[in-house]
Structures are given as structure tokens and as C-alpha cells.
């Protein structure tokens, strides 16, 4: 403000100087003096010029001082603060300092009292007032808008180890067992005890009639006969007890996150006040009352499951499941060692003629030659009608080989021709499972005996 005042005064003086010196001839007062007092005018003009020059010098010096003050002012950091509101009008400026005395003029007649001078121009705006005192504590704010959902909570720490489980309930009845796998070839059997009377077999081939003998004495028991065909399927065994429950299963995956809870209803908004003109920034008011709580954030992920609880006591055994279907019969075990002679038993009733066990062999070399089968106590051959590689494969498999080829005309055998029209698919485990004529029924001669070549 002071700068502005000084600059205004400077402009007035400059105008004065220019008018009185450079344009003196155009001034009416100058011309009047010139005409009224032509002799005095030159002397008076010279002295007046000196006064003006002195005043101009003083103005310039003041101007330089002002410039310095302006520099100080403009370089003040306060310049860059936010502009305050317009202050109240400043007080009337002080009366300007008295001008330097002019050179004495000729004594004039006493002047009348001059009219009152024009009112001075408004003073420059005064500086901002000091900062006001802290504002009064604000009223409680309106209820805040609903808070954004909270961030997902950090994973919880593992829960404590579960307590020992209570004793499990009795297991459910087990599912029906799967068909058992084919049994392995049995170990060498122990000498068997006397078998029960066999089921009635098919009528055997009629033997030649023997002469009727007289009833003989009880003979010593002979060595055990070759094992009979497998007996009828045994009765179903008692269900086994259910096995011990297995260890607990692995902890399941965490459940899916729950959905967010429903939002609370927002509070009513207060009526907005009309905006006031901003005052100078007051000191920070004390913290308003807490707004209503925002909507709850989503539930954090489940914590890591705690370690499994101690295994519960074994549950009571469940009811046994139904017995699985019997597995395929294993291969016939080797013949047992001959037992020691027991005491002679009482002669039993004569049983019906049963079938003997069956086995196969190759006559020629270990893996190539005539194919023979053992039935009803004697070895016999196979007729080559329908005999082909798929039949040979099954035959060879019975001897432990994995491959087989059918051969023909490998040399005539002797004795029985046990099989004819054997037709296997190649997947059977024994020839007895293949389609074929019944034992001993054929229309062949030994010239047609079948052969095989077997390979691992």
C-alpha cells in the first residue's frame, strides 16, 4: 500500500515538473506574470526552477528507497499465501509532510483564507489482520457415508489342535467285496485225509466186464489217488469282521467365503447450511464424534486348519459286507507227498466214477512237438480238426508260455484221442474252458494228432 501511495505521489510531482518547465509558455499563469511583471519574471523563474530540481532529486531518492522496500516486500514468502478476504478500509492517511519553503515571492496582498482542499484519495488497503482465535468446536458431523468394505482379513493363525475325537459309531455295513483275484498255484499239498463221498459224476466209459471176485480181505490202503476234479463250491463262509477304520482323511479344503452381511440403513442427512465466506484457516478443531460404523468388510479367509485331533477310539466293527464272488480257482497244486500208511479203515460204499485231474504235455522237445492231455488216468492226443494258433496259445499258456503256434503232422501218438474240434478264442486260461467235443468223442486217427510250438 505504501508503495502505491509513493508511486502516486511521484507521478504528481513529475506532472508538475513537466508542466512548469517544458510547457511554461502555454501556462496562463506564466503569461500573466510575464505581462504583469515582465522585469521580475526571469529572476522568479530561475529560482523556482532550482526548487523544482531539488524536489525532483528528493523524489528520485525517495523512489529508490521505495524500490528497495518493494524488493523486500515482494521477496517476502508471505506474498504467496492464499489471498485473504478484503480488509476493512484503512484509516485516513496522515497529512503529507510540509513542502519545502518556496523562494520568497514578492510580498503580495494578504490572501483570503483558501477553500478547504479536496478530500485525499483513499489510502491503500491495509495489511491483513492477525490470525483469528481458534474456531469453536464444530458440531458433530452428519453420519458418514457407508464405509467401503474392509480389506480381506489376514489369514488366521492355525487353530489349536483338536481334542481327541469321541469314539466313532459302528461302521456301516460294508459294500459287497469284489470278485477275488485268481489264486496262485497252490503249494505242494499235504497228504489229504480220506475224502467224503464224491458227487455223482457223469457215467464213465463202460469198462470191460470183470470176472466177479470173491470178497477180498481188507487190503492195506494204497497211495492216495490223483486229486479229483475240484469239489463243489463250499458254503459261503461266515462274514469276516470289519477291518479297523482307516486313519482320518486329509483335511478338506476351506469352505467358500461367506457372502457379505447386509448393509446397515444410512442415517438421515442433516439439512445443508448455506456456505459462509471462508475465514482465515482456524486451528484444527477437536475431533468430531465418530460417524456410524461403515458396512462390515468381507470375511477374511479361513485360517490354516489346526493339526488333526488325536485319532478317536476305534469304532465298533460294522456289520460284515456280503461275501464277494469267489475268485477263479488257482492252478492245481503239485501232488502231495505220499502219506504214511494209516490203519486200515472200514471199507466204504462204492462211489460213483468221478473224473480225474487233467494236465498237458508236449511230446518231442520241451517247447515243440505233439500236444497231449492227461485224463482219466491216461495220456491222450488232440485231433487237429479245427486246431489253430488260438488253441495252441491256450495250450502253451497252461505250460507257462506266453506264445503258441499250431503245428500239424508232428508224429502220430498212441492210445486215446481225448479231444477233437477244440475251438478256443485264445483268451481262455485252460483248454477245458474252450468249446470242444466231449472227452473221447472224435472221428480222427493218430495221423491227425495236433502239435504246438510254444514260446516265452
Amino acid at each position: 500500500v505504501q508503495v502505491l501511495n509513493l508511486q502516486a505521489r511521484l507521478r504528481v510531482l513529475e506532472m508538475y515538473f513537466l508542466n512548469d518547465t517544458l510547457a511554461a509558455e502555454d501556462s496562463p499563469s506564466f503569461s500573466l506574470l510575464q505581462s504583469a511583471h515582465p522585469g521580475e519574471h526571469l529572476a522568479q523563474g530561475a529560482s523556482r526552477l532550482q526548487v523544482l530540481q531539488a524536489q525532483l532529486t528528493w523524489v528520485r531518492v525517495s523512489h529508490e528507497h521505495l524500490l528497495q522496500r518493494v524488493d523486500n516486500f515482494t521477496q517476502n514468502p508471505g506474498m504467496f499465501r492464499i489471498k485473504g478476504e478484503q480488509g476493512a478500509p484503512g484509516l485516513q492517511g496522515h497529512k503529507g509532510a510540509m513542502g519545502m519553503p518556496g523562494a520568497p515571492g514578492p510580498p503580495g496582498p494578504p490572501a483570503e483564507k483558501g477553500a478547504k482542499g479536496a478530500m485525499g484519495r483513499d489510502g491503500a488497503t491495509g495489511p491483513s489482520g492477525p490470525q483469528g482465535p481458534p474456531g469453536v468446536k464444530g458440531e458433530a458431523g452428519l453420519q458418514g457415508p457407508q464405509g467401503a468394505p474392509g480389506k480381506q482379513g489376514a489369514t488366521g493363525t492355525p487353530g489349536p489342535q483338536g481334542e481327541k475325537g469321541s469314539k466313532g459309531d459302528g461302521g456301516l455295513i460294508g459294500p459287497k467285496g469284489e470278485t477275488g483275484t485268481k489264486g496262485e498255484k497252490g503249494d505242494l499239498g499235504l497228504p489229504g485225509s480220506k475224502g467224503d463221498r464224491g458227487m455223482k459224476g457223469d457215467a464213465g466209459v463202460m469198462g470191460p466186464p470183470g470176472a466177479q471176485g470173491s470178497k477180498g480181505d481188507f487190503g492195506r490202503p494204497g497211495p492216495p489217488g490223483l486229486a479229483g476234479f475240484p469239489g463243489a463250491k463250499g458254503d459261503q463262509g461266515q462274514p469276516g469282521l470289519q477291518g479297523v477304520p482307516g486313519p482320518p482323511g486329509a483335511v478338506g479344503h476351506p469352505g467358500a467365503k461367506g457372502e457379505p452381511g447386509s448393509a446397515g440403513s444410512p442415517g438421515r442427512a442433516g439439512l445443508p447450511g448455506s456456505p459462509g465466506s471462508p475465514g482465515a484457516t482456524g486451528l484444527k478443531g477437536s475431533k468430531g464424534d465418530t460417524g456410524l460404523q461403515g458396512q462390515q468388510g468381507r470375511k477374511g479367509e479361513s485360517g490354516v486348519p489346526g493339526p488333526a485331533g488325536v485319532k478317536g477310539e476305534q469304532g465298533s466293527p460294522g456289520l460284515a459286507g456280503p461275501k464277494g464272488a469267489p475268485g477263479q480257482a488257482g492252478q492245481k497244486g503239485d501232488q502231495g507227498v505220499k502219506g504214511s500208511s494209516g490203519e486200515q479203515g472200514v471199507k466204504g460204499e462204492k462211489g460213483e466214477r468221478g473224473e480225474n485231474s487233467v494236465s498237458v504235455r508236449i511230446v518231442g522237445s520241451s517247447n515243440r512237438g505233439r500236444a497231449e492231455v492227461y485224463y482219466s488216468g491216461t495220456w491222450g492226443t488232440i485231433c487237429d480238426d479245427e486246431w489253430q494258433n488260438s488253441d495252441a496259445i491256450v495250450f502253451c499258456r497252461m505250460l507257462g508260455y506266453s506264445k503258441g503256434r499250431a503245428l500239424y503232422k508232428v508224429g502220430a501218438g498212441t492210445g486215446q484221442i481225448w479231444l477233437d474240434n477244440v475251438q478256443c478264442r485264445g483268451t481262455e486260461s485252460t483248454l477245458w474252458s474252450c468249446t470242444k467235443n466231449s472227452w473221447g468223442h472224435h472221428d480222427c486217427s493218430h495221423e491227425e494228432d495236433a502239435g504246438v510250438e510254444c514260446s516265452v
Partner: antibody, heavy 120, light 107 residues
């Protein structure tokens, strides 16, 4: 000692026919499977047909299936190969060979061969 | 068809040498394999069948081994009459196929 003698080879034009014979002796012909095997000049061996001792089963290589026919006459101890629709690539020495046994088996005796040339 | 591959295709050796020829099948043929010898202008002659069974009348210096896909013919001590071409042949399935042959020459 087994003897096998082929005959019937010669020069024939593409598309023509030829019948080869193999006379067997010194073994019981009717007890053995018989085969035809050929060898192109300077090349390897190629089995082409088999017939069982009783003529019940016959097998052919794909290269001749539908064009060649194997047969036998056990009363004459003779094996035959009827060749139709001959092609240049059928040019070869044709051998008859006896199987070790009555059907499909290794070739334990061979004839001396007969040359068939298919050319225009 | 089962492919039979012999190695080497040719071989030079001297009388008295031990020689080995190999044959590989493109799939397992068990032991259903034979070896034949053929001399120029002559018919082939069966040496070994079923992988390792020596045909009657064949000298014992010839032997065969192997099963599945890899087989070997060995001549323990070469004789002058052994210089010829040797073929392997599978008898596991139709069509019966031969190897391309191994020509054994005098060094």
C-alpha cells in the same frame, strides 16, 4: 533226401498268366505244409503263399492276394502256383519250400527255383 | 507287417574268425525265428529254427540266441564253406517276413 523240382517259369507279358509246378519226392508229401517263396534278381527273399497238408488252409502275401492261387494234388505229389495278371515286379526266381510240419512252419527244404520274367 | 532288420548288411572276415550277425524285429515275436544260409545261384538252406534249435545236419559251430525282438546268429569259427548270405525270418504271424540279408565275405 527230400527233392523239390520247380517248373513252368519263363517269359510272359504284363497282364499274362503262368502256372508253376513243384514236383515232390522222397518224403510223404501229403504230411507237410508247402510254400512258395520268391527272390527278385539281386534282392532278398519274399514269402508269398502257404497251403496246409490237407489243403484246408491257404495263406497269401498282400502283394499277390487275388492274383495268385496255391493248390496241391497229394495223389500226384505236386504243388502248384497259378499266377494271373502278372506285373513287371513279379519278375523273380520262384522257389517251392517244404514246411517242417503239416501247416505253417519253418522252411526246411527248398527246390532249385524257376525264373519268371514279366516283360513286354 | 513285422519288419525284420539285419546288421551289418555285409561283413568281411577270415577263416577261423568268430562272427556275429544280428536281427531285430519291429515287434516281439517270442522265439519264432529262423536263420537261413544262401550261396550264389543256390536255394536257401535252413540252419536254425525256434530261435536256437539247430536243424539236423547243420554243423555245431552255428548257434542262435535271443527272444522277443533281438536275435543273434553266431559262427564260432568260420570255415571256407560258410562264406554266403544269411537271412533271418519271423514265423510269428502272417505274412512271414525275411531280413534284407547279411553278406559274409572273405577278408
Amino acid at each position: 533226401e527230400v527233392q523239390l523240382v520247380e517248373s513252368g517259369g519263363g517269359l510272359v507279358q504284363p497282364g499274362g498268366s503262368l502256372r508253376l509246378s513243384c514236383a515232390a519226392s522222397k518224403f510223404t508229401f501229403s504230411n507237410y505244409g508247402m510254400n512258395w517263396i520268391r527272390q527278385a534278381p539281386g534282392k532278398g527273399l519274399e514269402w508269398i503263399a502257404l497251403i496246409y497238408y490237407n489243403s484246408n488252409n491257404k495263406y497269401y502275401a498282400d502283394s499277390v492276394k487275388g492274383r495268385f492261387t496255391i493248390s496241391r494234388d497229394n495223389s500226384k505229389n505236386t504243388l502248384y502256383l497259378q499266377m494271373n495278371s502278372l506285373r513287371a515286379e513279379d519278375t523273380a526266381v520262384y522257389y517251392c519250400a517244404k514246411s517242417l510240419t503239416g501247416g505253417s512252419d519253418y522252411f526246411d527244404s527248398w527246390g532249385q527255383g524257376t525264373l519268371v520274367t514279366v516283360s513286354s | 507287417d513285422i519288419q525284420m532288420t539285419q546288421s551289418p548288411s555285409s561283413l568281411s572276415a577270415s577263416v577261423g574268425d568268430r562272427v556275429t550277425i544280428t536281427c531285430r524285429a519291429s515287434k516281439s515275436i517270442g522265439t519264432f525265428l529262423a536263420w537261413y544260409q544262401q550261396k550264389p545261384g543256390k536255394a536257401p538252406k535252413l540252419l536254425i529254427y525256434s530261435g536256437s534249435t539247430l536243424e539236423s545236419g547243420v554243423p555245431s559251430r552255428f548257434s542262435g540266441s535271443g527272444s522277443g525282438t533281438d536275435f543273434t546268429l553266431t559262427i564260432s569259427s568260420l570255415q571256407p564253406e560258410d562264406f554266403a548270405t544269411y537271412y533271418c525270418q519271423q514265423h510269428d504271424e502272417y505274412p512271414f517276413t525275411f531280413g534284407q540279408g547279411t553278406k559274409l565275405e572273405i577278408k
